[in-house]
């Protein structure tokens, strides 16, 4: 960057090289060039010469003043007009940054995705800081009082093997950058309560000709958790509102859920699960599209395959659930 150039003088920023966005700042340039008494000192921002708000402080120093500086990053350098030199002489350069101190991290969440071998902790970092901001995740055993710290710039994956202090922990997040430091509230967790089952996936769908045509959705998960609660939501692609069905599920076999849908309509389905009675849900599965037929023939769809026809499918066991309407987005 600009900071690696050989300097014939000094450039500095007040109040600091990294400062709060919107502040008034002063950039000072001091020449120290052999046999050059600068007639003029010039400032450049991102390679463009500044023409205003420059004040000569003394024989070798000038100040450039900015009001309400809003750029997240800028490269500044200054030059001297030396008599008897045919071009400007570079004095020095500096990269400057503006941004914000971190907000207090909130919505700290730690989950263990089944089979991952990690505890994944995330949080809401708040507003964009624009500058390098680091996070320290503190994990303290409530049984041994031993505390571990993990440095990251976003979320953190902590190996469950490293969590040797029992099952109960306090977790909190400290955010810090050049402009400030904040700390979240403490989250109390029990490792058995934060496991999220292996992802549920919709594999295919079929519409069966009957007195009233019905659509069967086939879905499964590789989870070994015995008691799992799931939700399937669906809607016509033209609708805003989701319908939600709830299931108590045993994944020893492929799940089949039946729906009575309008003919000749394109629908979208998603599923998610949680360990029954626990706090955290899986994220909603990928969108699965299925178009119901106009009339008699059977139609089958597979994940990400739209409007696929198939007449030779039979129905195995059916799992039924309770129908609700849902306007919610994804919930963690």
């Amino acid at each position: 960057g600009i900071t690696n150039i050989n300097c014939s003088g000094h450039i500095w920023v007040e109040p600091a090289t990294i400062f709060k966005m919107g502040m008034n700042i002063s950039i000072y340039c001091q020449a120290a060039i052999k046999n050059c008494q600068p007639r003029k000192l010039h400032f450049y921002k991102n390679g463009i010469k500044e023409r205003f708000q420059i004040t000569r402080i003394n024989k070798t120093t000038a100040r450039l003043w900015y009001k309400n500086f809003l750029e997240p990053h800028a490269s500044m350098y200054c030059t001297a007009e030396c008599p008897k030199h045919f071009q400007e002489t570079l004095i020095c350069g500096k990269d400057i940054s503006s941004g914000y101190p971190p907000d207090i991290p909130d919505e700290v969440t730690c989950v263990i995705y089944e089979y991952s071998g990690n505890m994944t902790c995330t949080w809401n970092a708040g507003k964009l800081t624009y500058i390098d901001t680091k996070y320290v995740v503190h994990v303290k055993s409530l049984e041994t009082e031993e505390e571990q710290q993990y440095l990251t710039s976003s979320y953190i994956n902590i190996s469950t093997d490293s969590l040797q202090g029992g099952k109960k922990y306090l977790v909190w997040v400290q955010a810090a950058n050049a402009l400030g430091m904040e700390e979240s509230k403490q989250l109390q967790i029990h490792l058995d309560d934060i496991v999220i089952p292996s992802a549920a996936v919709i594999s295919r769908a079929e519409t069966i000709n009957a007195t009233v045509p019905k659509t069967i959705i086939y879905w499964d998960s590789q989870t070994t958790i015995e008691k799992v609660s799931c939700e399937m939501r669906y809607k016509a692609t033209t609708n805003q509102t989701w319908n939600v069905k709830e299931f108590d599920t045993n994944f020893t076999y492929v799940q089949q859920s039946e729906f009575y849908l309008e003919p000749n309509i394109k629908y979208v389905f998603q599923v998610r699960c949680q360990e029954t009675g626990k706090r955290y849900w899986q994220p909603w599965s990928s969108l699965f599209f299925h178009k119901t037929p106009e009339t008699v023939p059977q139609v089958t769809s597979k994940a990400f395959q739209h409007d696929t026809w198939n007449s030779g499918l039979t129905v195995a066991s059916i799992s039924t659930g309770h129908l609700t309407s849902d306007n919610r987005g994804d919930i963690g």
Partner: antibody
Framework: QVHLVQSGTEVRKPGASVKVSCKVS????????IHWVRQAPGKGLEWMGG????????IYAQRFQGRVTLPEDTSTDTAYLDLFNLRSEDTAVYFC?????????WGQGTLVIVSS | DIQMTQSPSTLSASVGDRVTITCRAS??????LAWYQQKPGKAPKLLIY???SLESGVPSRFSGSGSGTDFTLTISSLQPDDFATYYC?????????FGQGTKVEIK
């Protein structure tokens, strides 16, 4: 264009002090390094001191150290030479000059006569 | 301090002559050397800087050469206005020092 105008002839007794002024125009004093050079009657040029822009300080010739100061008044763009404890051998023409490395503009000179 | 030695001290020449003045430094200056012309009762006038660069407005009959410790001022064809005293000056280090001067007079 730089223009340097110096004060007029001064007559002093040995042991006295003298203040010679050098008024700058065309540029401000903040944009110029002023140096002082003297020339005794019939002799060569002798550098006395001036501002070194590389180190941001006034440097004096060893033989004048402690007997000369080079103050400046940036509000009036005037540089001064203060010479103390005058001796008869200080009789000379005193020049201010701008150092753009080298001295490219000179004042007209100020004659200082030290005589009892 | 760097000692600057000019030669000759006095030089008698005629209009149209080619005149050469030399200046020797007691240590290397790179190219930080200037030449001045001074007439009686006047301030010195810069002719050459950085050993060989001609100051703006100075006639091209003046030229400078050399580097390190040995430098030369040449007037290719002496004119009536050129009869004066010439000084070299080093501006490599402080204190700045001048040669003792070379007086060019009419033969």
């Amino acid at each position: 264009q730089v223009h340097l105008v110096q004060s007029g002839t001064e007559v002093r007794k040995p042991g006295a002090s003298v203040k010679v002024s050098c008024k700058v125009s065309g540029y401000t004093l903040n944009e110029l390094a002023i140096h002082w050079v003297r020339q005794a009657p019939g002799k060569g040029l002798e550098w006395m001191g001036g501002f070194d822009p590389e180190h941001g300080e006034i440097i004096y010739a060893q033989r004048f150290q402690g007997r000369v100061t080079l103050p400046e008044d940036t509000s009036t763009d005037t540089a001064y030479l203060d010479l103390f404890n005058l001796r008869s051998e200080d009789t000379a023409v005193y020049f201010c000059a701008t150092e753009a490395a080298p001295f490219d503009y000179w004042g007209q000179g100020t004659l200082v006569i030290v005589s009892s | 301090d760097i000692q600057m030695t000019q030669s000759p001290s006095t030089l008698s020449a005629s209009v149209g002559d080619r005149v050469t003045i030399t200046c020797r430094a007691s240590q290397s200056l790179s190219s930080w050397l200037a030449w001045y012309q001074q007439k009686p009762g006047k301030a010195p006038k810069l002719l050459i800087y950085k050993a060989s660069s001609l100051e703006s407005g100075v006639p091209s009959r003046f030229s400078g050469s050399g580097s390190g410790t040995d430098f030369t001022l040449t007037i290719s064809s002496l004119q009536p206005d050129d009869f004066a005293t010439y000084y070299c000056q080093q501006y490599d280090i402080y204190p700045r020092t001048f040669g003792q001067g070379t007086k060019v007079e009419i033969k």
